[in-house]
């Protein structure tokens, strides 16, 4: 980019309502002008949740986002929301690129910038750009949760970030599930944390001028074993028309490996229950949780005989859980019935 160039998204036309998240790299010192919506009805620009004022070095004005000269602290997430609603018209992240200087490629990058160059930016040791986002120092979570540590920083040259766990370099290679390092967001993400993840996590942010660090504490509560948990309301009572297809859904949560069965309640010799007090059932489907689509029972081309009570039964080494639902099968649609009840199938 030439020093005089601006970053522009598009002219201020009516926006698409399906804005994809974008990332734009902007050189230090570069002017920025982004548009969102028509000029007279332009959206409101927000940076990191705070609405931009119509005046100032960084301003949101008549649908435009204008930055006279991009600085490291201008990096971050910008949203444009439609006036009078929360519809996102633009969702983008501005990332600090190299500064706009006339230096040669072979010049020592640490050398002093020419102060007469209006686009130069003095070298600066790393600093925290959003310390308020780092206030939650202790993260105490149950096992299975996702944990995200952030150390948003800036500096010139743009600093690098690395992570330590309990004082040792941390790349997550020994961690089941690994880690996600999102350098543009200055973050470390660990999914499905386990007790062995507990410890002190240090972000170390460095550039040629200096370094800063910050410590987070992570405690992980081991889950006590329990029988499977079934999501409330599933499977759901369902009404279908003869000849249609039906899906019954059962959502199972279990730390220990669960085993799932789909049962249909049946009648034998006019009775629904045996002498032992347990209902008569027919096993329709059985599998472990990792089998594909075990949590869904498909009933194709249903007939009146398919009507009745269905149970999702889940068990693990600790115990059993089950929930039931009723399938009602209506005769084939006739014009009168359709007019009275336009929805042929519904879920209670």
């Amino acid at each position: 980019l030439e020093a005089s160039e601006e970053v522009e998204l598009e002219p201020c036309l009516a926006p698409s309502l399906e804005q994809q998240e974008q990332e734009l790299t902007v050189a230090l010192g570069q002017p920025v002008r982004l548009c969102c919506g028509r000029a007279e009805r332009g959206g409101h620009w927000y940076k990191e949740g705070s609405r931009l004022a119509p005046a100032g070095r960084v301003r949101g004005w008549r649908g435009r986002l204008e930055i006279a000269s991009f600085l490291p602290e201008d990096a971050g997430r910008y949203l444009c929301l439609a006036r009078g609603s929360m519809i996102v018209l633009q969702n983008l992240t501005l990332i600090t690129g190299d500064s706009l200087t006339s230096s040669n490629d072979d010049e020592d990058p640490k050398s002093h910038r020419d102060p007469s160059n209006r686009h130069s930016y003095p070298q600066q040791a790393p600093y925290w750009t959003h310390p308020q986002r780092m206030e939650k120092k202790l993260h105490a979570v149950p096992a299975g949760n996702t944990v995200k540590f952030r150390c948003p920083a800036a500096g010139n040259p743009t600093p690098t970030i690395r992570w330590l766990k309990d004082g040792q370099a941390f790349h997550g290679e020994n961690r089941i599930g690994g880690i996600r390092l999102r350098h543009q967001h200055w973050s470390l993400v660990m999914e499905s944390v386990v007790p062995s993840d507990r410890g002190t996590y240090t972000c170390l942010v460095e550039n040629a001028v200096g370094s800063i660090r910050y410590n987070y504490l992570l405690d992980v509560l081991e889950r006590s074993p329990h029988r499977p948990i079934l999501q409330a309301g599933l499977p759901a009572n369902t009404t279908a028309v003869v000849g249609s297809d039906v899906e019954l859904l059962c959502k199972v949560y279990s730390d220990a490996q669960p085993h799932i069965q789909w049962l249909k309640h049946i009648v034998i010799n006019g009775s629904s229950f045996g002498a032992d007090g347990f209902p008569y059932v027919q096993v329709l489907k059985t599998a472990d949780i990792n089998s594909s689509e075990v949590e869904v029972l498909y009933l194709r081309n249903v007939s009146a005989e398919d009507a009745g009570e269905y149970t999702c039964l889940a068990g693990n080494s600790i115990g059993l859980s089950y929930q039931s639902a009723w399938l009602t099968v209506l005769p084939e649609e006739d014009p009168t019935w359709t007019a009275a009840a336009p929805e042929a199938r519904y879920t209670d």
């Epitope: 939650k136 979570v141 002190t200 660090r213 410590n215 509560l221």
Partner: antibody
Framework: EVQLVESGGGLVQPGGSLRLSCAAS????????MNWVRQAPGKGLEWVGM????????TLEQKFKDRFTISADTSKNTAYLQMNSLRAEDTAVYYC??????????WGQGTLVTVSS | DIQMTQSPSSLSASVGDRVTITCRTS??????LNWYQQKPGKAFKILIS???RLHSGVPSRFSGSGSGTDFTLTISSLQPEDFATYYC?????????FGQGTKVEIK
């Protein structure tokens, strides 16, 4: 065997200063958080703050931030609590305790600080 | 800050008695609750972490239970060496906070 030994307590006048020491042994001092907890006479326990000796990052309870500072000397395996502008209500037994993330697994015997004229 | 309310503040019991101490927090702390024992002239000792996990060397007559905001420390059969003061502490958020303590005395 992990041992924590506090020292430096005593009688000090209101407005005065005092520096408490906590000598640690029996474990790797640098990578465990060291906490200070105090107990006023007849009262419960109150967390003062903590330090990670490896980089001397400290976190202090809000009410102590303007008067107390925590530091550590890794060459001596010792943590310090510097208390300035002391008040009568700072009279307490001060304990250092090793932090294991969200709990305190080892404690010193405590050192008594009395602020009185 | 998370407030801790411990009760009773003191109790008298005899050897062999079952003793229960409760701790209530001002907000949900999941199971990040620890119990400590303080004896005169001795250092504090951690008894239970994460609501119910007994620390090594702690007798099995000590047990902990609860979740969310209500927690209990139980001594199933009080022994002479158990006469002491007990404190709960939350480890869910900074600043760490403690209960006011429960002194268990000989009846």
């Amino acid at each position: 065997e992990v041992q924590l030994v506090e020292s430096g307590g005593g009688l000090v006048q209101p407005g005065g200063s005092l520096r408490l020491s906590c000598a640690a042994s029996g474990y790797t001092f640098t990578n465990h958080w060291m906490n200070w907890v105090r107990q006023a006479p007849g009262k419960g326990l109150e967390w003062v703050g903590m330090i990670l000796p490896v980089d001397s990052e400290t976190t202090l309870e809000q009410k102590f931030k303007d008067r107390f500072t925590i530091s550590a000397d890794t060459s001596k395996n010792t943590a310090y609590l510097q208390m300035n502008s002391l008040r009568a209500e700072d009279t307490a037994v001060y304990y250092c305790t090793r932090g294991d993330i969200s709990l305190f697994d080892y404690w010193g015997q405590g050192t008594l600080v009395t602020v009185s004229s | 800050d998370i407030q801790m309310t411990q009760s009773p503040s003191s109790l008298s019991a005899s050897v062999g008695d079952r003793v229960t101490i409760t701790c209530r927090t001002s907000q949900d702390i999941s199971n990040f609750l620890n119990w400590y024992q303080q004896k005169p002239g001795k250092a504090f000792k951690i008894l239970i972490s994460y609501t119910s996990r007994l620390h090594s060397g702690v007798p099995s007559r000590f047990s902990g239970s609860g979740s969310g905001t209500d927690f209990t420390l139980t001594i199933s059969s009080l022994q002479p060496e158990d006469f002491a003061t007990y404190y709960c502490q939350q480890g869910n958020a900074l600043p760490y906070t403690f209960g006011q303590g429960t002194k268990v005395e000989i009846k």
